[in-house]
């Protein structure tokens, strides 16, 4: 082993993750953002799409197991559907049962992501911090 | 660029993070991993260190900024040396001023970790959640 | 209601500027995006851009356009508009506004019904 | 840029036959895919989003399958009103992108 190596080795059990936008976090090949300012969730919705990115979408507590931990509560990219009841994320997919605890916190056609996978309905034009998420292949 | 934008930056590059242990989160490329098994403070140094890491060390606001919104308690790689009365970090280092307020929950000489940089002072043989990490280059 | 402004309507000399505008009724513009698409005779469908109809300014390009083209609207009249300049012959096309619904995959889910721009001396 | 492929670039058939038309993407796009169908002089109308989701009033003899790179538009019972040109979309990342369309003709 020369100590001018050609190659970076890595640990088996070590790897990269991403790619993701610069000062994001990275986990299990997603990439998430945490945003401070309180927006409504359309300028929510807005703010993740000028990135290329979508508000939070919760698809797998495994994958996902991240979330089980943050505080407060943030805007994600679930919407009520009237004309049929759903929810549904920005991607167009309906929410999967099981994986979101809904809770009606306000009338409303949008939802809050907070700790424990769960889900509180709010009114879309109430302003709140929220989670950008961009989904790595 | 912070995790908490108060504008919002649209990424010039994309960039990898890490490496990591498989699975870990990655960010400003530190690595970290919550468990959620009940340790005490010297089993939960012993499982980082088994991972080739350490527990948490807080060192800047400004690139861990993805701490303030923990939720819960965690052991951090903080302990109290009595014979001087400071806190120390793992590595030796002493802790900085201002980085985190530390609370007297508890007489002890271990720190857990609270969401906005706040540290719980505990007794060591307490069980709790804890916190590994990992520096890369 | 999608209307296309300059001398001869939708026709354009080479290297000319031409403006076209789109005026947004029957739903809140401030929760939307516009997006420009058009469509060559017998050709596929091409994106142009997009622009937020609400308070942020946040707009896209397709790489092609390579600053020949700038969006703009006017929130307070629901109205976007799509600046076309240094106009050549394959920009000949017709120019839809759409609305950009990002809760529906981003999908295009109402079209205007075109402006045809003719680019010819 | 992400490049749709759709397959076949026509198709003839009859009334009441089932048509399948494929779109392929040259990366993953998860399911941020979207179909429309365009009639002649006319400006192309949403189909279907989420790679699986009917548009308000589209009949159900449209579905829609596939997830990530490879995606399928069924018409299950061809009626006279769907012979058109129908053309899938990415939303997954700008640039959005078409596929060049699949023309539905009578046999």
């Known amino acids: 082993n020369s100590l001018f190596n050609q190659e970076v080795q890595i640990p088996l059990t070590e790897s990269y993750c991403g790619p993701c936008p610069k000062n994001w976090i990275c986990y299990k090949n997603n990439c998430y953002q945490f945003f401070d300012e309180s927006k409504n969730w359309y300028e929510s919705q807005a703010s993740c799409m000028s990135q290329n990115a979508s508000l939070l979408k919760v698809y797998s507590k495994e994958d996902q197991d991240l979330l089980k931990l943050v505080k407060s509560y943030h805007w994600m990219g679930l919407v009520h559907i009237p004309t049929n009841g759903s929810w549904q994320w920005e991607d167009g997919s309906i929410l999967s049962p099981n994986l979101l605890t809904i809770i009606e916190m306000q009338k409303g056609d949008c939802a809050l992501y907070a700790s424990s996978f769960k889900g509180y309905i709010e009114n879309c034009s109430t302003p709140n911090t929220y989670i950008c998420m961009q989904r790595t292949v | 660029n912070s995790l908490f934008n108060q504008e919002v930056q649209i990424p010039l590059t994309e960039s990898y993070c890490g490496p990591c242990p498989k699975n870990w989160i990655c960010y400003k490329n530190n690595c970290y991993q919550f468990f959620d098994e009940s340790k005490n403070w010297y089993e939960s140094q012993a499982s980082c260190m088994s991972q080739n890491a350490s527990l948490l060390k807080v060192y800047s606001k400004e690139d861990q900024d993805l701490l303030k919104l923990v939720k819960s308690y965690h052991w951090m790689g903080l302990v109290h040396i009595p014979t001087n009365g400071s806190w120390q970090w793992e590595d030796g280092s002493i802790l900085s001023p201002n980085l985190l307020t530390i609370i007297e929950m508890q007489k002890g000489d271990c720190a857990l970790y609270a969401s906005s940089f706040k540290g719980y002072i505990e007794n060591c043989s307490t069980p709790n959640t804890y916190i590994c990490m990992q520096r890369t280059v | 209601e999608q209307s296309g402004g300059g001398a001869g309507g939708g026709l354009v000399k080479p290297g000319g500027s031409l403006e076209l505008c789109c005026k947004a009724?029957?739903?809140?513009?401030?929760?939307?995006?516009m997006s420009w698409v058009r469509q060559s005779p017998g050709k596929g469908l091409e994106w142009i851009g997009r622009?937020?109809?609400?308070?942020?300014?946040?707009?896209a390009y397709a790489s092609w356009v390579n600053g020949r083209f700038t969006l703009s609207r006017d929130i307070d009249q629901s109205t976007g508009c799509l600046q076309l300049n240094s106009l050549t012959a394959a920009d000949t096309a017709m120019y839809y506004c759409?609305?950009?619904?990002?809760?529906?995959?981003?999908?295009?889910?109402?079209w205007g019904q075109g402006t045809l721009v003719t680019v010819s001396s | 840029d992400i490049q749709m492929t759709q397959s076949p670039s026509s198709v003839s058939a009859s009334v009441g036959d089932r048509v399948t038309i494929t779109c392929r993407a040259s990366?993953?796009?998860?399911?941020?895919l979207v179909w429309y169908q365009q009639k002649p002089g006319k400006a192309p109308e949403l189909l279907m989003y989420?790679?699986?989701t009917l548009q308000s009033g589209v009949p159900s003899r449209f579905s829609g399958s596939g997830s990530g790179t490879d995606f399928t538009l069924t018409i299950s019972s061809l009626q006279p009103e769907d012979f058109a040109t129908y053309y899938c979309?990415?939303?997954?990342?700008?640039?959005?992108?078409f596929g060049q369309g699949t023309k539905v003709e009578i046999k």
């Open positions: 759409v609305r950009l619904n990002p809760s529906f995959s981003r999908s295009f889910d109402y």
């Open positions: 979309q990415q939303g997954y990342s700008t640039p959005y992108t």
């Open positions: 009724s029957g739903f809140d513009f401030s929760i939307y995006w």
């Open positions: 989420g790679a699986s």
């Open positions: 990366q993953g796009i998860f399911s941020w």
């Open positions: 622009i937020y109809g609400g308070s942020s300014d946040y707009t």
